[in-house]
């Protein structure tokens, strides 16, 4: 079996963590977030070939069925396996508040 | 905001649970599973338009960035939110064994 972390599609094409630079405007947050003004958003992007970072048995099944009928069953998808928390300074009716979000920035990725 | 469960793309086109009929051969299990001979595999298939079954804040961010740069950031992806367990009767060196798998059949779906 192939090493689950070696990408057969070529450098950088398989499921991995990417960083995308975004402003509050880009994120649609300008009206309710004060800070940070810009965010390094970490997200999971890339293809999920056979055996690559398979999250579970379901991903394995999905890949096998995708190979049989790809117009019906899509390939597994690159999604966060876990998240890093992030603190936002938000506008409130009375002023500002600090809020921690646990599901905002991807920490690592797998294929489901 | 749109209702998170109303599909704007037309009936059945958005992220939802599908059942795919599969044999042990289809799944690549013929050499190690005895029963069941056929499986009704439940999996998550369909598009993830804006606000549809968004799993978390990350999905919301991903959708916003996808709209800004679709060639860089893919749309959120339809994946299992939870799983149903399934028992397989497996071949072993000494005979057979019953094994429960908790991550095999999707129970419900969301967009990440």
């Amino acid at each position: 079996a192939r090493n689950g972390d070696r990408c057969p599609l070529g450098p950088g094409r398989c499921c991995r963590l990417h960083t995308v630079h975004a402003s509050l405007e880009d994120l649609g947050w300008a009206d309710w977030v004060l800070s940070p003004r810009e965010v390094q958003v970490t997200m999971c992007i890339g293809a999920c070939p056979s055996q690559f970072r398979e999250a579970n048995m379901h991903a394995q099944i999905k890949m096998n069925l995708h190979r049989l009928k790809p117009d019906t069953v899509p390939a597994p998808c690159c999604v966060p396996a876990s998240y890093n928390p992030m603190v936002l300074i938000q506008k409130t009716d009375t002023g500002v508040s600090l809020q921690t979000y646990d599901d905002l920035l991807a920490k690592d990725c797998h294929c489901v | 905001a749109r209702n998170g469960d109303r599909c704007p793309l037309g009936p059945g086109r958005c992220c939802r649970l599908h059942t795919v009929h599969a044999s042990l051969e289809d799944l690549g299990w013929a050499d190690w599973v005895l029963s069941p001979r056929e499986v009704q595999v439940t999996m998550c298939i369909g598009a993830c338009p804006s606000q549809f079954r968004e799993a978390n804040m990350h999905a919301q961010i991903k959708m916003n960035l996808h709209r800004l740069k679709p060639d860089t950031v893919p749309a959120p992806c339809c994946v299992p939110a939870s799983y149903n367990p399934m028992v397989l009767i497996q071949k072993t060196d000494t005979g057979v064994s019953l094994q429960t798998y908790d991550d095999l059949l999707a129970k419900d779906c969301h967009c990440v």
């Epitope: 079996a1 057969p8 599609l9 070939p49 055996q51 117009d71 019906t72 390939a75 | -």
Partner: antibody, heavy 121, light 106 residues
Amino acid sequence: QVQLQQPGAELVRPGTSVKLSCKASGYTFTSYWMHWVKQRPRQGLEWIGLIDPSDNYTNYNQNFKGKATLTVDTSSSTAYMQLGSLTSEDSAVYYCASYDGYSTPSAMDYWGQGTSVTVSS
Amino acid sequence: QIVLSQSPAILSASPGEKVTMTCRASSSVNYMHWYQQKPGSSPKPWIYATSNLASGVPARFSGSGSGTSYSLIISRVEAEDAAAYYCQQWSSYPPTFGGGTKLEIK
């Protein structure tokens, strides 16, 4: 640019076997699935099977199980199809065609020029 | 396996005419793909996923359909369109092709 090179023709005897080649260039060989398709004279297209060069996974049309065997040599970016126990029914043009399994739904996007196999004594 | 039936088998048209060829599936499929093949050449992808034109295909071509019925349409046929056109599905295993429609230009 992507190219799939196949030899033009093969003349073979009944009962023997033949190994057809398809040399790929212009892309990462392990990133595309490789299909093989049969076309008999003045007839339509018939899918034989596919191989995923990334892990040697194969699946075959039931009609060709036992007839065709698909393999790859990743070091030379070449796909092969061996056809066994040849009869006149196997006389046809055989195409290899690459397919991006990770951009579905898609078509078989690049095709070789085809190898014409003639089975004759 | 899913059987794809193409009609008509042979289609004769004059330059400038609108042409429609159909592909019917024995069971419902999610998408249809189309290939063009000229004599002595290999098939070329022409339309993928029902309605998307492959690279380099003229805009006079279009594709449509759903379920069991799909069509390839040429709004104004030209001499260079003379060829065989094959439909193909891969919603179900194994992938299958239609028998083809041969387009002749008068």
